[in-house]
């Protein structure tokens, strides 16, 4: 006959931090040395035995005299209420045929965590609980005095809960957020009427969720140490030492070795010299609440990240070539390195790849003379490319070479009694053609009428012009640029004995914001090209002199430069260059890139004032030095008369007042007789020039009173 195997000696212990009940019991009457499969049903009640809050089954194999263990976690802090536990059992083993029946319940075991025995009248639980963001948390208060009104607040906002008994109220906080690393504050205040009986707060420590490490990778630079790195993600450390930053551990499964890492995002692993080639690493991130891990499997020889090359040098450097040498840190015998060279200079970048064993060498060719280059090199394992090393670099400068192009030369010839004054100009050679620092220019002047006669003028750089006084002969002038290595090709220009073509008429042109568009008639006969030169009309020609070379088949060009300023007049001359390099003036043009209104008004004199007329004149007014072509003048006249004088028409001034206006369309007409006036009458006048852009500045009117008919002026 079967004995009911009732659970006995039930003991319940608690873990307040984990909010767990731990049950221990034994089963009496179990046959000696026999194992039975059994099911235990456990009941848990809260506050009173009739209030069952949890029922569950626990299946296990039971041995004779065995102490059984089972734990249960409460969502409610154990300090909030008394709990009761009982247990019954059922044999569920094939060795015993049906029917199986449940044993009697054990007696109720009462569990009370007395943390509210102090002098306070209000307690809040749990104290200093650590949870993960997104967790559901239950808190409670225990009030000694049921007459007290208790209000609770989460981060200053009142919360409402469920009363478990007259002394206890519980609050369910769903999916708690991370607010700050020193915790979330919750407090309750007990009061009677308007009198505070006490306040009690707790800190709920909410941790951010531990992330899986990202970008986990290991590599070696010397086959002695593996350097592993990862992105740790969010730091889950909390204040008050409640939870330190997460820890990181490396575990290698083939060797079974483990290492606690001391840095949050990297760890070094010593490679043992036992020829282990394959590594299987697990990186474990861990905090008080959870573990996260990530795995990598790799062959050591496929993860070589070399130290950067060293001893970068340049040998046999000349104007156009150099040999670049470098060394690499030798890490294994018969190791082949792939190296990449980058050459930066003159705004360009070239890239070359080379395979080496120990020392690197590369022949750099087609370099520019007198140029600073930056060359750098990086290397990698040629057999199993993993990643490039860091760059190692050095600057070097190629040697100078003789200038490769003749200077661009032009001239201004001015005729003076008995001679020519030739002002010679040249443009500095570009860096590309100078091939070094230009030290001086040689100007060789050869009299073509007396071939044996020549002069050499040496002009130190950076001068870009010189003045030559020559007699009325024909001259060939050569200009040569020199640096420390040698001389450039010569630039040749011929000055004719004949005077320049003075019959050329000057033509007015209008510029645009883009500059000046010029065209000309082709020069009769053979030409090797055209030259357009220009300068500021009002300035000394040497100050702002420019020129442009144009090909022989071109009869138009656009001169565009940022130097053109609004309101400035520029004079252009177009020359044809004959095969003998003699310049012939073809056309002259003048104009403004943008005309402006006149900057000043003429100084007007009043002449021959009579009782019926007066004469206005402004003979001294210069039309040349104006910010636009003066097209004429506006004469404004005010009088008491309602009607305007003949030739004058009504006009409204900018201030809204009315007057009479007369327009003079000839800029050289600088006088006007105003007649048909009344004696002893008061008149006012004002004269302003105008360009295509408008009138001159507004100014005050000048007052004139005609005398009586008997007066003589």
């Amino acid at each position: 006959e079967r004995l009911p195997l009732t659970p006995v000696s039930l003991k319940v212990s608690t873990n307040s931090t984990r909010q767990s009940l731990h049950l221990q019991w034994t089963v009496h009457n179990l046959p000696y040395h026999q194992e039975l499969k059994m099911v235990f049903q456990i009941q848990i009640s809260r506050i009173e035995t009739s209030n069952v809050i949890w029922v569950g089954n626990y299946s296990t194999t039971v041995k004779w005299n065995q102490v059984l263990h089972w734990s249960w976690e409460s969502e409610l802090p154990l300090e909030c209420a008394t709990h009761f536990v009982r247990i019954k059992s059922l044999v569920d083993d094939a060795k015993f045929p049906e029917p199986n029946f449940w044993s009697n319940w054990s007696s109720w075991e009462e569990v009370s965590v007395q943390d509210s025995t102090g002098q306070d009248i209000l307690f809040v639980f749990p104290k200093d609980k650590l949870v993960e963001e997104g967790t559901n948390v239950t808190i409670c208060y225990v009030s000694r005095n049921i007459q007290n009104n208790v209000s609770c607040y989460l981060e200053g906002k009142q919360i409402h809960g469920e009363q478990l008994d007259p002394h206890v109220t519980a609050f369910n906080l769903n999916s708690v957020p991370f607010i700050r690393n020193k915790g979330t504050n919750i407090y309750c205040e007990a009061s009677q009427g308007n009198v505070s009986e006490g306040m009690k707060g707790i800190v709920l420590f909410v941790s951010k969720v531990l992330e899986e490490p990202k970008d986990f990778s290991c590599e070696t630079e010397d086959f002695k140490t593996l350097h592993c790195t990862w992105d740790p993600g969010t730091d889950t450390a909390l204040g008050w030492s409640k939870q330190p930053s997460q820890s990181y551990t490396l575990f290698e499964s083939f060797s079974g070795e483990k290492k606690l890492c001391t840095h949050k995002n990297w760890c070094n692993w010593q490679i043992t010299q036992d020829s282990q080639e394959t590594y299987n690493f697990t990186l474990i991130a861990e905090n008080y609440l959870r573990k996260r891990s990530v795995n990598i499997l790799f062959n050591l020889t496929h993860r070589v990240y070399l130290m950067n090359p060293f001893s970068v040098n340049f040998e046999n450097v000349n104007a156009t070539n150099a040999i670049m040498t470098w060394k690499v840190h030798s890490i294994r015998n018969n190791f082949t390195y792939l190296c990449q060279i980058e050459l930066h200079g003159e705004g360009k970048m070239m890239q070359y790849n080379v395979s080496i064993k120990v020392n690197g060498e590369y022949f750099l060719s087609e370099l520019e003379p007198a140029t600073e280059y930056m060359a750098r090199v990086r290397c990698a394992d040629a057999s199993h490319f993993w990643k490039w090393s860091e760059w190692s670099g050095q600057n070097f400068t190629t040697l100078e070479a003789a200038p490769s192009e003749a200077p661009d030369v032009w001239r201004i010839v001015s005729l003076e009694p008995g001679n020519h004054t030739v002002t010679l100009f040249w443009k500095p050679l570009s860096k590309l053609h100078a091939n070094g620092k230009i030290l001086f220019y040689n100007v060789v002047v050869e009299n073509l009428d007396k071939p044996s006669s020549s002069e050499l003028h040496s002009i130190p750089a950076p001068a870009n012009s010189t003045k030559l006084i020559l007699d009325r002969c024909s001259y060939q002038i050569c200009v040569i640029a020199n640096n420390s290595v040698g001389a450039s090709p010569a630039s040749v220009i011929v000055i004719s004995a004949d005077p320049e073509n003075k019959e050329v008429e000057e033509e007015r042109i209008a510029g645009t914001e883009g500059g000046f568009s010029l065209s000309w008639k082709p020069q009769p006969g053979d030409v090797i090209g055209y030259v357009v030169d220009w300068c500021d009309h009002t300035q000394d020609v040497l100050g702002d002199f420019q020129w442009k070379n144009v090909g022989p088949n071109t009869t138009s060009t656009v001169i565009s430069t940022d130097a053109f300023r609004p309101g400035v007049r520029y004079d252009f001359r177009i020359y044809g260059l004959s095969t003998k390099r003699i310049a012939c003036l073809l056309e002259k043009k003048t104009g403004y890139s943008q005309e402006l209104a006149p900057s000043d008004n003429p100084h007007v004199l009043v002449d021959t004032l009579t009782s019926h007329s007066f004469t206005l004149s402004w003979k001294d007014y210069s039309t040349e030095s104006q910010p636009g072509f003066i097209q004429g003048y506006h004469v404004y006249l005010k009088s008491k008369a309602r009607q305007c004088h003949p030739r004058f028409e009504k006009a409204v001034l900018s201030d809204g007042s009315e007057c009479c206006k007369y327009k003079i369309d000839n800029p050289e007409e600088k006088a006007l007789i105003v007649d048909n006036l009344k004696p002893e009458s008061f008149y006012e006048f004002f004269i302003t020039p105008f360009t295509s852009a408008g009138e001159g500045p507004s100014a005050t009117f000048t007052k004139v009173t005609t005398p009586d008919e008997h007066s003589s002026m």
Partner: antibody, heavy 121, light 110 residues
Framework: QVQLVESGGGLVQPGRSLRLSCAAS????????MHWVRQAPGKGLEWVSG????????GYADSVKGRFTISRDNAKNSLYLQMNSLRAEDTALYYC??????????????WGQGTLVTVSS | QPVLTQPPSASGTPGQRVTISCSGS????????VNWYQQLPGTAPKLLIH???QRPSGVPERFSGSKSGTSASLAISGLQSEDEADYYC???????????FGGGTKLTVL
Amino acid sequence: QVQLVESGGGLVQPGRSLRLSCAASGFTFDDYAMHWVRQAPGKGLEWVSGISWNSGSIGYADSVKGRFTISRDNAKNSLYLQMNSLRAEDTALYYCAKDITSSGWYWFDYWGQGTLVTVSS
Amino acid sequence: QPVLTQPPSASGTPGQRVTISCSGSNSNIGSNAVNWYQQLPGTAPKLLIHSHNQRPSGVPERFSGSKSGTSASLAISGLQSEDEADYYCAAWDDSLNGPVFGGGTKLTVL
């Protein structure tokens, strides 16, 4: 009835030491963080140090770090402040204050009457 | 030098409304609760307002607190002669890892 009574103040020479005590009653002492706050004559309040219910977390103002040590004895319901290398600027009325929470970063709902520390040669 | 800034003095006549300001930074008032303490002449400080605007039981409704950004203020309406005292604002400071106080405002009832 919550009571906090400070003692141990007095006149002391610069560079010397002093130990303040605070006897607590009327509440469950080991359930709360405790603090020391001082007030120089005619001046405002300055937090000096704080300690959590189980001494697991301790904090100090920069002005006293390395010189002052806070401690508690929950069995004796007492809070202490060991003050070493005292300076003239430490002269103040030292208050013992009770936090409303165990971890100690809320506010002080009860204060003692203070004990005067005078540092002078 | 106090971390939180208060006006040194304020005054009002009985029945009037008086406001005391307290300005700080992101690391204190900007991210933490503000508390106010009242210190009557010759006595220890007493908690007046906590969590920006919460009055402990027993503190008259005439006292109210508010916070905006990195500033807080204490308002006293219907001023009474017994309100003459020093008022201190306080908040936890995340940078200094401790509570910080204002320099205090002496309120005079005229």
